[in-house]
């Protein structure tokens, strides 16, 4: 999906209002220095591309974040403010359905969410630079 035509201001507002709080809740008990951020993003479409991929693509060490509240809200926000996004997300929906029922938060998932927070913060910063 090409995120170029999203309403970035509306996505920023949704992030600041709800998604950020859910991410921070998920990370509660860990310090921002606990994990080394190894990925970043260049501009707003790039940030959203990587956020979407990291949120919804299962990785070997963290099977799925897609069932988490912040992921559901991210999906809803992108569907709302990115034209045509929801039609491209059949695979992501299937991944959410296949997600493990157990609510165990592994250290690797915490690390992945720490990376996500970094990408979201970069998204906000690139938005501020453009204004």
């Amino acid at each position: 999906y090409d995120f170029t035509n999203c309403d970035f201001q509306k996505i920023e507002a949704d992030y600041l209002r709800t998604i950020s709080k859910d991410l921070i809740t998920y990370m509660s008990g860990t310090k921002s220095t606990d994990f080394n951020n190894t990925v970043s993003c260049s501009n707003r479409p790039h940030c959203l591309t990587e956020i979407q991929s990291l949120t919804f693509n299962p990785t070997p060490r963290c099977a799925s974040l897609a069932k988490e509240m912040f992921a559901r809200k991210t999906k809803a926000t992108l569907a709302l403010w990115c034209p045509g996004y929801s039609e491209t997300q059949i695979n992501a929906t299937q991944a959410m359905k296949k997600a493990r029922k157990s609510k165990v938060t592994t250290n690797k998932c915490l690390e992945q969410v720490s990376q996500l927070l970094g990408l979201w913060r970069r998204f906000i910063r690139t938005l501020l630079k453009k204004q």
Epitope: V39, S40, T59
Partner: antibody, heavy 117, light 108 residues
């Protein structure tokens, strides 16, 4: 200390597909970062080809996108480049590199690929 | 595509002298700029990222400055091992990251 090593044929015929592999040691490619390919024609500057991130997102240089495929094999800690329909203009030293998806902090030593019949 | 133009193409200096290399972007890249050093037969090495942050293990004699379209790499006092080609790279314009054509710093 992460180390990267490119391997593959040094000679490819025009119209064929160039295939290279980068073997990474000292760091798991599924643990973090992105894993990129960059090339440098003899005596010329650098050109970014694309990357695959540790979580599987892939990004390509638009000028090469129609011909490029980057993939990975996490069990071997390797990632690969395929460039189809090559011409003499694709003759270059090809580097693999670790990236934070912005810039490139560790590089392989490079491998020269010549396109010639 | 953002075009990166480096000047001069060649800089002839003696060890101990100060080197000032310029990189200009065809449009603003904010501070999304990196500098690399490449010696003959070797891979490039990251020196500077985010326009002014030194990469791990890079000596303090290397410094970067600038923002927007004009950037400078300064080597305060050239050591013999600093004679090489230097490239700038912008990473503001994903997915079209571009490099400058390089500046060669040679011994006078």
């Amino acid at each position: 200390q992460v180390q990267l090593q490119e391997s593959g044929p040094g000679l490819v015929k025009p119209s064929e597909t160039l295939s290279l592999t980068c073997t990474v040691s000292g760091y798991s490619i599924s643990s973090g970062y992105g894993w990129s390919w960059i090339r440098q024609p003899p005596g010329k500057g650098l050109e970014w080809i694309g990357y695959i991130s540790y979580y599987g997102s892939i990004s390509y240089n638009p000028s090469l996108k129609s011909r490029v495929t980057i993939s990975r094999d996490t069990s071997k800690n390797q990632f690969s480049l395929k460039l189809s329909s090559v011409t003499a203009a694709d003759t270059a030293v090809y580097y693999c590199a670790r990236t934070n998806l912005l810039y490139f902090d560790s590089w392989g030593q490079g491998t020269l690929v010549t396109v010639s019949s | 595509e953002i075009v990166m133009t480096q000047s001069p193409a060649t800089l002839s200096l003696s060890p101990g002298e100060r080197a000032t290399l310029s990189c200009r972007a065809s449009q603003s890249v904010s501070n999304n700029l990196a500098w690399y050093q490449q010696k003959p037969g070797q891979a490039p090495r990251l020196l500077i990222y985010d326009a002014s942050s030194r990469a791990t293990g890079i000596p303090a004699r290397f410094s970067g400055s600038g923002s927007g379209t004009d950037f400078t790499l300064t080597i305060s006092s050239l050591e013999p091992e600093d004679f090489a080609v230097y490239y700038c790279q912008q990473y503001s314009d994903w997915p079209q990251y571009t490099f400058g054509q390089g500046t060669k710093v040679e011994i006078k």
